[in-house]
Amino acid sequence: TLNSVLNSNAIKNLPPPLGGAAGHPGSAVSAAPGILYPGGNKYQTIDNYQPYPCAEDEECGTDEYCASPTRGGDAGVQICLACRKRRKRCMRHAMCCPGNYCKNGICVSSDQNHFRGEIEETITESFGNDHSTLDGYSRRTTLSSKMYHTKGQEGSVCLRSSDCASGLCCARHFWSKICKPVLKEGQVCTKHRRKGSHGLEIFQRCYCGEGLSCRIQKDHHQASNSSRLHTCQRH
């Protein structure tokens, strides 16, 4: 379950989020059972690639989405699949490669003029706690620079970081994803030891800003592995 993922994951070492206690009182969280491997390495070796199990798109790379590998397959068995290119069939925006979105079941370019009108809406896994992020996860960049729609401000719903205004990234917020501030020097960050180790964080912090990296705070070097506090520090 998601709870067991959180218990085996770096997020358990975070201080309580600004928006609530560490245990998130008042909420119960569940996830599809048996398909999260938070310690797993998504890319084992080039010649020994193994499908990466997932529950939601956030667990996959920038150019991937989470789905059952077989058409109409068992929803309980899902893996990261390559994103769909332009003019390919889709069911939701996250299935389309960056720079595209899902309209009427087809991946179309985000930089076309139809962005002006009320286009078929968009994804949202969106709720709000700033203390939650993948170090680097949301760097899913680049929609075309010709975009016509307004960039999201902090607190607005997003699909990728390119949907958010400068200085913000798109990070999971409970059931959704919203624009949150990129972390500044000295702010607590989340360090994931290996790609794909984050599992399904119910909220995320953004990554550290330019010129900063997420490192163990100096005075925490002596602490046990499980309680080391990471902060954004100058390279």
Epitope: L18, A31, E121, T122, T124, F127, S176
Partner: antibody
Framework: QVQLVESGGGLVQPGGSLRLSCAAS????????LHWVRQAPGKGLEWVSS????????YYADSVKGRFTISRDNSKNTLYLQMNSLRAEDTAVYYC?????????????????WGQGTLVTVSS | DIQMTQSPSSLSASVGDRVTITCRAS??????LNWYQQKPGKAPKLLIG???SLQSGVPSRFSGSGSGTDFTLTISSLQPEDFATYYC?????????FGQGTKVEIK
């Protein structure tokens, strides 16, 4: 345009069960986080439950935890709330709500669109 | 849980009046706050997202401000159709919580 239509409300005895449905149209259902919010007669709004767009993460208010189950069928464009062990204090209008989109103008926010609600009355 | 305290709980005003409703969070919620308008027998309608973003189709006489713990919804010149109940919602922490509502009545 976006439409959310709740159904399944009615009169039920304490301890009984009901299943609410929210039929969605006018948007790509599987792209959105969805919610149930209720309002007791003459009272304020109370969040009940939320579900992520793919359905793998669910959230509940303490007052309904263990009794209510939120689910969604993306192939049917429908959100559900299964309510068991109903109590008098569950009497309320139940609204289904949907998040906004990053493509809204301006970009959207959570709990952006609401259905008209369905009344659930728990009484003996 | 994060408590949201709205004030006043009700107010009487005349058409053309400037009306201010406040919402205070029991802890900092950044700008993760929405404002809704609800008329009797109707569903809530989102007016303002993320504390200050006016939603499409909402008249410009509505505005929102604030960050952290104190937030304000202002109606610059009250119109007959504005008589309703207004709610704030925080979505910074779980569970999301609403204010108790402010009923705006005709004086």
């Amino acid at each position: 345009q976006v439409q959310l239509v709740e159904s399944g409300g009615g009169l039920v005895q304490p301890g009984g069960s009901l299943r609410l449905s929210c039929a969605a149209s006018g948007f790509t259902f599987s792209n959105y986080g969805l919610h149930w919010v209720r309002q007791a007669p003459g009272k304020g709004l109370e969040w009940v439950s939320s579900i992520s767009y793919y359905g793998s993460s669910t959230y509940y208010a303490d007052s309904v935890k263990g009794r209510f189950t939120i689910s969604r069928d993306n192939s049917k464009n429908t959100l559900y709330l299964q309510m068991n062990s109903l109590r008098a204090e569950d009497t309320a209008v139940y609204y289904c709500a949907r998040d906004g989109s990053h493509m809204d103008k301006p970009p959207g926010y959570v709990f952006a669109f609401w259905g008209q609600g369905t009344l659930v009355t728990v009484s003996s | 849980d994060i408590q949201m305290t709205q004030s006043p709980s009700s107010l009487s005003a005349s058409v053309g009046d400037r009306v201010t409703i406040t919402c205070r969070a029991s802890q900092g919620i950044k700008n993760y706050l929405n404002w809704y308008q609800q008329k009797p027998g109707k569903a809530p309608k989102l007016l303002i997202g993320a504390a200050s973003s006016l939603q499409s189709g909402v008249p410009s006489r509505f505005s929102g401000s604030g960050s952290g713990t104190d937030f304000t919804l202002t109606i610059s010149s009250l119109q007959p159709e504005d008589f309703a109940t207004y709610y704030c919602l925080q979505y910074y922490g779980m569970p999301p919580t609403f204010g108790q509502g402010t009923k705006v009545e005709i004086k």
